[in-house]
Amino acid sequence: AWELTILHTNDVHSRLEQTSEDSSKCVNASRCMGGVARLFTKVQQIRRAEPNVLLLDAGDQYQGTIWFTVYKGAEVAHFMNALRYDAMALGNHEFDNGVEGLIEPLLKEAKFPILSANIKAKGPLASQISGLYLPYKVLPVGDEVVGIVGYTSKETPFLSNPGTNLVFEDEITALQPEVDKLKTLNVNKIIALGHSGFEMDKLIAQKVRGVDVVVGGHSNTFLYTGNPPSKEVPAGKYPFIVTSDDGRKVPVVQAYAFGKYLGYLKIEFDERGNVISSHGNPILLNSSIPEDPSIKADINKWRIKLDNYSTQELGKTIVYLDGSSQSCRFRECNMGNLICDAMINNNLRHTDEMFWNHVSMCILNGGGIRSPIDERNNGTITWENLAAVLPFGGTFDLVQLKGSTLKKAFEHSVHRYGQSTGEFLQVGGIHVVYDLSRKPGDRVVKLDVLCTKCRVPSYDPLKMDEVYKVILPNFLANGGDGFQMIKDELLRHDSGDQDINVVSTYISKMKVIYPAVEGRIKFSTGSH
């Protein structure tokens, strides 16, 4: 028997520095977690103690903090090289800055293979990107070899900016021939490493013949056997065992997100490459694990540029950006309109001739807006200003909801109107009319939404049974501010880009902004 230790991360999302327990900015260092310096300490400890170790990443290193905003992926290559990762799969967020933003900072600089079997380049890009990412890689580990085959969510064109010269194929269809190829090369230990979410990970384990282990990402799934060490609630045991169609027991793992845990899986193979046993658990990277001094020093050196960036002008406003609670928790506010417009703009994807865009709607809890911006400061808007408006370090995510769920959400928006509560919704691509003289739960008298399957966008009445795509803060997708109906009834949820980054990119693109209050939210006569 031969034993392999798989260490794995996924959905790190730019958390190079240690974070608080909820993966936001570290406030009290004695209770902070994760970060590449601490990760390196644990990885090195395991490498010293165990003979056959692989360190793998299942994608979405990109996007999530000011580190990515400033360094644009160069930080990912640098610190993943320093940690000596053995392989990485491409995630959807690796395409956030387009293909160029993947090739130059990461693909050309990484000293480890970057993988995806279901992304096929075409046209002029094919030769430019050739060899920079691979469908699979055979890695020597001790006296043996292990095949790693990569995959990426086929939804990436809707979630990021891969452009028109990359085709995202069905994962299972694309993986099988690559695994077969590995088998013909006498590679009998094969890991599928990828970024399509836990449901797809399980399907790959079930359907792709020859895959021995699946290491996944995208769905931020936390698996654990026994009593979990922090506040994440396990979605199942670690590893999660799937019985394949050909009768094998295939371990499937994921390690939550944000570098809070290091996945730790021990696999025992027989001489024919069959999995005899698998066990392990994610390791919580808490403050009991010291940060490696040399990596920490490097982090501090790279940090300097971030502090300078915070005060640089992103663009200008020629109007007062009203982010006051008096406005945003009671009525349409132009700061809410600005943020929603930025959220939609960040999700412009012309993937189908029938649709001007795949999503037209935005909702945003007024309580999430935490500061106005005064135009009398020469109109200057900085990252620092935006960090005061959006101080909680969230993401703007893409969900699919039925019209009936949206109606419930808008009823919830005003169910206790008038108390300066945070659930009052700011919107984009939506026209809503409330009648506050009616009883709570029956106050939405008109709800029109901007069409997507149209060449000239116009507002049509919401249909209760139709499925709509909506951009919203992750806080709402997770049921925050009492929006339990969103959490309970959402049909799909894909995590998006860092909130401040979305707004800063929009302002930089527009250069000068002047959002207005324009009748997106109205109150019918007699009630307001």
Epitope: D22, S325, Q326, R370, S371, A388, S420
Partner: antibody
Framework: VQLVESGGGLVQPGGSLRLSCAAS????????MHWVRQAPGKGLEWVAV????????YYADSVKGRFTISRDNSKNTLYLQMNSLRAEDTAVYYC??????????WGQGTLVTVSS | IQMTQSPSSLSASVGDRVTITCRAS??????LAWYQQKPGKAPKLLIY???TLQSGVPSRFSGSGSGTDFTLTISSLQPEDFATYYC????????FGQGTRLEIK
């Protein structure tokens, strides 16, 4: 995150007192702020709240018209001006951020004693 | 909106499973929090939104309920859990329950 209350002490019935709460370690101007009090040996009683930029204020019925909450975001400080004090206002006064939410932090409290 | 906690005090031993209940005078959806307070200290948030565990709080604490009836459960009492517990609604202007004193048996 640190919240430090000050300004408590002994005051006669009908008198006034101004409490302060100095905040550090977080973006004070982004958070709604509350005052909560606790009479000796009794339970917790919410007193007042002020929104992050100061435009919304709400008070408990027991203090309405007598107490005024205010803040100075440039000084990272929350205040509670207490007028027409009564014996039943005797309590430890806590300032707190966004109570009952993820960003929930409390100070250590300052004792106000109203007695003749 | 009034909050009524029960019991007002209870005695239990280390390792016991303990349940404290809180009833709102009208429906408050899931706008309910649970606090722990030790003598001479500020209250500490345990649970918010009826069932969400605050960061750093041990997983032996859990909350449930919606509408008018809510429960705080400590699955296996530890010595440091002996304290006073308060529920608090934030549906309207905040209001605390009268407290439940948890003592060592």
């Amino acid at each position: 995150v640190q919240l430090v209350e000050s300004g408590g002490g002994l005051v006669q019935p009908g008198g006034s007192l101004r409490l302060s709460c100095a905040a550090s370690g977080f973006t004070f101007s982004s958070y709604d702020m509350h005052w909560v009090r606790q009479a000796p040996g009794k339970g917790l009683e919410w007193v007042a709240v002020m929104s992050y930029e100061g435009s919304n204020k709400y008070y408990a019925d027991s203090v309405k018209g007598r107490f005024t909450i205010s803040r100075d975001n440039s000084k990272n400080t929350l205040y509670l001006q207490m007028n027409s004090l009564r014996a039943e206002d005797t309590a430890v006064y806590y300032c707190a951020t966004e109570i009952a939410a993820k960003g929930d932090y409390w100070g250590q409290g300052t004792l106000v004693t109203v007695s003749s | 909106i009034q909050m009524t906690q029960s019991p007002s005090s209870l005695s239990a031993s280390v390792g016991d499973r303990v349940t404290i209940t809180c009833r709102a005078s009208q429906g408050i959806s899931n706008y309910l929090a649970w606090y722990q307070q030790k003598p001479g200290k500020a209250p500490k948030l345990l649970i918010y939104a009826a069932s969400t565990l605050q960061s750093g709080v041990p997983s032996r604490f859990s909350g449930s309920g919606s509408g008018t009836d809510f429960t705080l459960t400590i699955s296996s009492l530890q010595p440091e859990d002996f304290a006073t517990y308060y529920c608090q609604q934030s549906y309207s202007t905040p209001h605390f329950g009268q407290g439940t004193r948890l003592e060592i048996k």
